[in-house]
């Protein structure tokens, strides 16, 4: 697995460099997670032909994966820093159950899947420090998450491959939209 942000050789070689700001740390953390997703997608795409499926075909699924919408205030039209930040944190919290599902889905990238999961937890902590309105953030219900996890794990092999692919693609898109918005804050 790649080295977590802040621990790469460049950081070691430059001890007198200015410490990262909160925004820089968040930016670096998201890019680190995106690198992890990229590695996981490589394994998934090598294993199955899901990656060749059209977006329209894949949209026909009953997974309730978090997605950015106009009302969330993260796009240029209707941009709202506070609303958007709440959406980003809420969405990441909702993704956690799906990242848990990914944990036993990889053979050669098991460590990478764990790194993506743990790095996301750290990212949520970074973002919660940045948010002023923590009361607006709804935490998913653990019981609902547990039954969802059981349901996903009970699917047949083909559906599990499809689910894995969809989670990775949706999480990547969510992180990209989040970082685009965060770079405006």
């Amino acid at each position: 697995a790649p080295v977590p942000p802040g621990e790469d050789s460049k950081d070691v070689a430059a001890p007198h460099r200015q410490p990262l700001t909160s925004s820089e740390r968040i930016d670096k953390q998201i890019r680190y997670i995106l690198d992890g997703i990229s590695a996981l997608r490589k394994e998934t795409c090598n294993k199955s032909n899901m990656c060749e499926s059209s977006k329209e075909a894949l949209a026909e699924n009953n997974l309730n994966l978090p997605k950015m919408a106009e009302k969330d205030g993260c796009f240029q039209s209707g941009f709202n820093e506070e609303t958007c930040l709440v959406k980003i944190i809420t969405g990441l919290l909702e993704f956690e159950v799906y990242l848990e599902y990914l944990q036993n889905r990889f053979e050669s990238s098991e460590e990478q899947a764990r790194a993506v999961q743990m790095s996301t937890k750290v990212l949520i902590q970074f973002l919660q420090k940045k948010a002023k309105n923590l009361d607006a953030i709804t935490t998913p219900d653990p019981t609902t998450n547990a039954s969802l996890l059981t349901k996903l794990q009970a699917q047949n092999q083909w559906l599990q491959d499809m689910t894995t692919h969809l989670i990775l693609r949706s999480f990547k898109e969510f992180l990209q939209s989040s970082l685009r918005a965060l770079r405006q804050m």
């Epitope: 998201i30 995106l34 796009f75 898109e173 990209q176 939209s177 970082l179 685009r180 770079r183």
Partner: nanobody
């Protein structure tokens, strides 16, 4: 890194239009975010517009909003910047840049590949 080539620049009268293209031969260009920047003589390079890996996610500088439109055609490995209602102050060298993370943004540091630029001159 991807090799980027801009084209479509030229001399145009105020109020006129131009369509710039940013093309690459690189595979997986569809996964890159692409931004347009411009640099007028004696001025800093500034952000114009960008488009994420998801084509619906675009962002514009206030000075061009409503006049410029950024779009992408992944089948052709090309990103376009359509410029309408051009003004003399739009005169600059226009550069396209790509971000392998598919994110983009309004700062030059977010991009890892740059083109050589194409000159746009708005004058009567």
């Amino acid at each position: 890194e991807v090799q980027l080539v801009e084209s479509g620049g030229g001399l145009v009268q105020p109020g006129g239009s131009l369509k710039l293209s940013c093309t690459t031969s690189g595979r997986r260009f569809s996964e890159y975010a692409v931004g347009w920047f411009r640099q007028a003589p004696g001025k800093e390079r500034e952000f114009v517009a960008d488009i994420g890996e998801q084509a619906e996610n675009t962002w514009y500088a206030e000075s061009v909003k409503g006049r410029f439109t950024i779009s992408r055609d992944d089948a052709k490995n090309t990103v376009y910047l359509e410029m309408d209602g051009l003004k003399p102050e739009d005169t600059a060298v226009y550069y396209c840049a790509a971000d392998k993370y598919g994110v983009g943004g309004n700062a030059q540091g977010y991009y890892d590949s740059w083109g050589q630029g194409t000159q746009v001159t708005v004058s009567s």
